[in-house]
């Protein structure tokens, strides 16, 4: 369960994926579409607002007041439109919908070192936001070991 | 109850080597990053190694890059560090610490309660 | 690499006093700090993480702010168990941290 309905920070932040594409995101038909993409060089990288939340894993453990808690985060590009993870169809998605969110809309951090992130399907452990044939979709992940995968890596900047 | 337990340090001549040692329990080890942060005598904190969940990423402060190495059993619940090639600026207590969160980098949760090394001839 | 700066490196107030500690990143950090309070002879122990939440069973006296590159601790009424090493901490862009701030007792 989330610990608490309001995120604990924020961060205003650009997505690429580890090979340095950008995650762009394209209103088409008043609907939003995401694409992974090379930037020009002096092209405006769009930026997300991820929210972070604390989430207790559900365990015995007990001890120093954080074990089992992960960081669970949000990303919304847009006023009102979050990403959600569509598991039917292991695709990723942006609706618009207003809070309390889903938990289609929450995924479970995970970093390789500070700024290189994974993304993890709250409603589908294992299942991660992934690239594949230039679009987000939902990758499962079968051990530890393939979360160092390339493709489900993604770096967080400022610029 | 959460424990870090260090252990491994002592008098070391300097070029020498010594391995530390932190074992873990009242937590699911596998699941936090752990690192190693030491203190010389009378000085403030410093961030000396990291080693994410499955062990599989290592990083390390730049003045010991090339002489220690962290690792982890997750099997038995520990996290060393072995130090070659020691220096007297090497000389502090080391402490042993977990992250604050499953498998994320953020903060250190829990501490353990240190173990000096001393560097000298 | 990032540097941090705390300020000032010894700090002395009355028990009940307002005190607050700054601290200083050389690069915007995105409120991917803490602090850490370590009384002599002991480990250091979290206090605050990502800027202002508070550790589980510390004190609701100790608060933390800030954005960017300035970060402050405050502890609203200063009380003698207070007295430590308060060291600031980021984690925006690898590991560092502040040289720390010394509180005393007047």
């Known amino acids: 369960s989330i610990t608490g309905i309001s995120p604990i920070t924020e961060y205003l932040a650009s997505l690429s994926t580890y090979n340095d594409q950008s995650i762009t995101f394209a209103l088409e038909d008043e609907s939003y579409e995401i694409y992974v993409e090379d930037l020009k060089k002096d092209e405006k990288k769009d930026k997300v607002l991820l929210s972070y939340y604390e989430s207790q894993h559900p365990s015995n453990e007990s001890g120093d007041g954080v074990d089992g808690k992960m960081l669970m985060v949000t990303l919304s590009p847009t006023k009102d439109f979050w990403l959600h993870a569509n598991n039917k169809e292991h695709s990723v998605e942006l609706h618009k919908c207003e809070k309390p969110l889903p938990d289609q809309a929450f995924f479970v951090l995970h970093n390789m070192h500070s700024n290189c992130v994974s993304f993890e399907c709250k409603t589908d452990p294992g299942v991660f936001i992934g690239v594949k044939d230039n679009h987000l979709a939902l990758i499962k992940v079968d051990s530890s070991e393939n979360l160092c995968t390339e493709n489900i890596l993604f770096k967080l900047s400022e610029t | 109850e959460v424990q870090l337990v260090e252990t491994g340090g002592g008098l070391v001549q300097p070029g020498r080597s010594l391995k530390l040692s932190c074992v873990a329990s009242g937590f699911t080890f596998s699941n936090y990053w752990m690192y190693w942060i030491r203190q010389a005598p009378g000085m403030g904190l410093e961030w000396v190694s990291s080693?994410?969940?499955?062990?599989?990423?290592?990083y390390y402060l730049d003045s010991v890059k090339g002489r220690f190495t962290i690792s982890r059993n997750n099997a038995e619940n520990t996290v060393y560090l072995q130090m070659n090639s020691l220096r007297s600026e090497d000389t502090a207590t080391y402490y042993c610490?977990?992250?604050?969160?499953?498998?994320?980098?953020?903060?250190?949760?829990?501490w353990g309660q240190g173990t000096l090394v001393t560097v000298s001839s | 690499d990032i540097q941090m700066t705390q300020s000032p490196s010894v700090l002395s107030a009355s028990v009940g006093d307002r005190v607050t500690l700054s601290c200083k990143a050389s690069h915007n950090i995105n409120k991917h700090l803490d602090w850490y309070q370590q009384k002599v002879g002991e480990a250091p122990k979290l206090l605050i993480y990502f800027t202002n939440n508070l550790q589980t069973g510390i004190p609701s006296r100790f608060s933390g702010s800030g954005s960017g590159t300035d970060y402050t601790l405050t502890i609203s009424s200063l009380q003698p168990e207070d007295v430590a090493t308060y060291f600031c901490?980021?984690?925006?862009?690898?590991?560092?941290f502040g040289q720390g701030t010394k509180v005393e007792i007047k």
């Open positions: 901490f980021q984690y925006n862009s690898g590991w560092t």
């Open positions: 080693i994410n969940n499955d062990g599989g990423n290592t």
């Open positions: 610490a977990k992250g604050h969160y499953y498998y994320t980098s953020y903060s250190f949760g829990y």
